[in-house]
């Protein structure tokens, strides 16, 4: 039994890091393998992650981590019984994929303005809380070409757009994702989408 593709990990910079790797043949990850991880810090304890299968030879492990900060570095040991298959390290702050924003809501009761709001996925004492920027994707269910991205580069998790920038009388969907420039993160997954019917009064033509 050998590791074909070494583990690569990403962190949500809050409580979970996800590691994926591939073996050189079909493997029952949960029964044959264990991923041990330990913070390089005074008094830290070793933890064991039981991997799950991710395709025939692929494995994935969700590492639970407390109080993740930028100085943290973890040692990783992949074991098959008594055999050490791979040894490495992982610094969560260098491989961040933020959590997806939540609670996306479209407020249509503001005169001819659409207000989209969502929730920051981090608590205020997490460093990413004040450093997320967002991309809002709006598209028409009727017209695949009517697809647009709005970049929200300010901290407030909201976006105002004129309803008239979208077509009236049809349904739209929106979703939002986040990233943080400070840690050079990847984009988060998209939030669940929300749907609304866009209608507004056409301006009266003289």
């Amino acid at each position: 039994m050998k590791v074909l593709q070494e583990p690569t990990c990403v962190s949500d910079y809050m409580s979970i890091s996800t590691c994926e790797w591939k073996m050189n043949g079909p493997t029952n990850c949960s029964t044959e393998l264990r991923l041990l991880y330990q913070l390089v810090f005074l008094l830290s304890e070793a933890h064991t992650c039981i991997p799950e299968n991710n395709g025939g030879a692929g494995c994935v492990c969700h590492l639970l981590m407390d109080d993740v900060v930028s100085a943290d570095n973890y040692t990783l040991d992949l074991w098959a019984g008594q055999q050490l298959l791979w040894k490495g390290s992982f610094k969560p702050s260098e491989h961040v994929k933020p959590r997806a924003p939540g609670n996306l809501t479209v407020h249509t009761n503001v005169s001819d303005t659409l207000l989209l709001t969502w929730s920051n996925p981090y608590p205020p004492d997490n460093y990413l809380y004040n450093h997320l920027t967002y991309a809002v994707n709006i598209w028409s269910e009727n017209d695949p070409a009517d697809f647009r991205i709005y970049n929200v580069t300010y901290l407030e998790p909201s976006l105002r757009i004129a309803a008239s920038t979208l077509k009236s009388g049809i349904s739209y969907r929106a979703r939002v994702r986040a990233w943080a420039q400070c840690y050079n993160t990847t984009w988060s997954e998209w939030s669940p989408s929300t749907k609304w019917h866009n209608s507004y009064r056409e301006p009266f033509e003289q």
Epitope: D67, V69, S70
Partner: antibody
Framework: QVQLVQSGAEVKKPGASVKVSCKAS????????MHWARQAPGQGLEWMGI????????SYAQKFQGRVTMTRDTSTSTVYMELSSLRSEDTAVYYC?????????WGKGTLVTVSS | QSVLTQPPSVSAAPGQKVTISCSGG????????VSWYQQLPGTAPKLLIY???KRPSGIPDRFSGSKSGTSATLAITGLQTGDEADYYC????????????FGTGTKLTVL
């Protein structure tokens, strides 16, 4: 919100022991390390030791080795710092502080006065 | 007692900029992250900067930190009377068992 509430001021005789408590609230108690530091009047900060509330393991500064004991009670989310064989130089404000490499949350401090 | 050296005092007028230095060695600042704490009279220290240059939520951007080699610097711009306090740098020392160490402290006076 995170709160670290420390016990009240103490006056002790030389040679006695003191036990200072630090009750945590507003977060998962066992998920965060707790440090103890002290500050003598008009002096700087001095690290004393650290406890991992999850398993109760500890590490102490060499200067306090053999005189300090840090414990925790997970049922009340409280950590304790006991310092024995007190001398006048131990007169200081004692702080608990939450964190690993740096400390974002501090208790208000407990003044321990050692005087005959 | 302190492994890190800071100037005992600095002063400047309101609105001005002031810098506080923190000098260490290869076994501490040179090998670890630096944090800075503000201690107002009669209160517990408060985290101002961590990870050399990052500010916790709620700390204004008038406060900034930097690190170069075995020394670190705290800069405060647009000085306010409320900034008058003691300032401490902190890091980890790995010369023996790893342990946190603090600077000697700097008293900031806003003239």
């Amino acid at each position: 919100q995170v709160q670290l509430v420390q016990s009240g001021a103490e006056v002790k005789k030389p040679g006695a022991s003191v036990k200072v408590s630090c009750k945590a609230s507003g977060y998962a108690f066992t998920s965060y390390y707790m440090h103890w530091a002290r500050q003598a009047p008009g002096q700087g900060l001095e690290w004393m030791g650290i406890i991992n509330p999850s398993g109760g393991s500890t590490s102490y500064a060499q200067k306090f080795q053999g005189r300090v004991t840090m414990t925790r009670d997970t049922s009340t989310s409280t950590v304790y710092m006991e310092l024995s064989s007190l001398r006048s130089e131990d007169t200081a404000v004692y702080y608990c502080a939450r964190g690993k490499w740096w400390w974002q949350h501090w208790g208000k401090g407990t003044l321990v006065t050692v005087s005959s | 007692q302190s492994v890190l050296t800071q100037p005992p005092s600095v002063s400047a007028a309101p609105g001005q900029k002031v810098t506080i230095s923190c000098s260490g060695g290869s076994s501490n600042i040179g090998n670890s992250y630096v944090s800075w704490y503000q201690q107002l009279p009669g209160t517990a220290p408060k985290l101002l900067i961590y990870d050399n240059n990052k500010r916790p939520s709620g700390i204004p951007d008038r406060f900034s930190g930097s690190k170069s080699g075995t020394s670190a610097t705290l800069a405060i711009t647009g000085l306010q009377t409320g900034d008058e306090a003691d300032y401490y740098c902190g890091t980890w020392d790995t010369s023996t068992t790893p342990m946190p160490v603090f600077g000697t402290g700097t008293k900031l006076t806003v003239l």
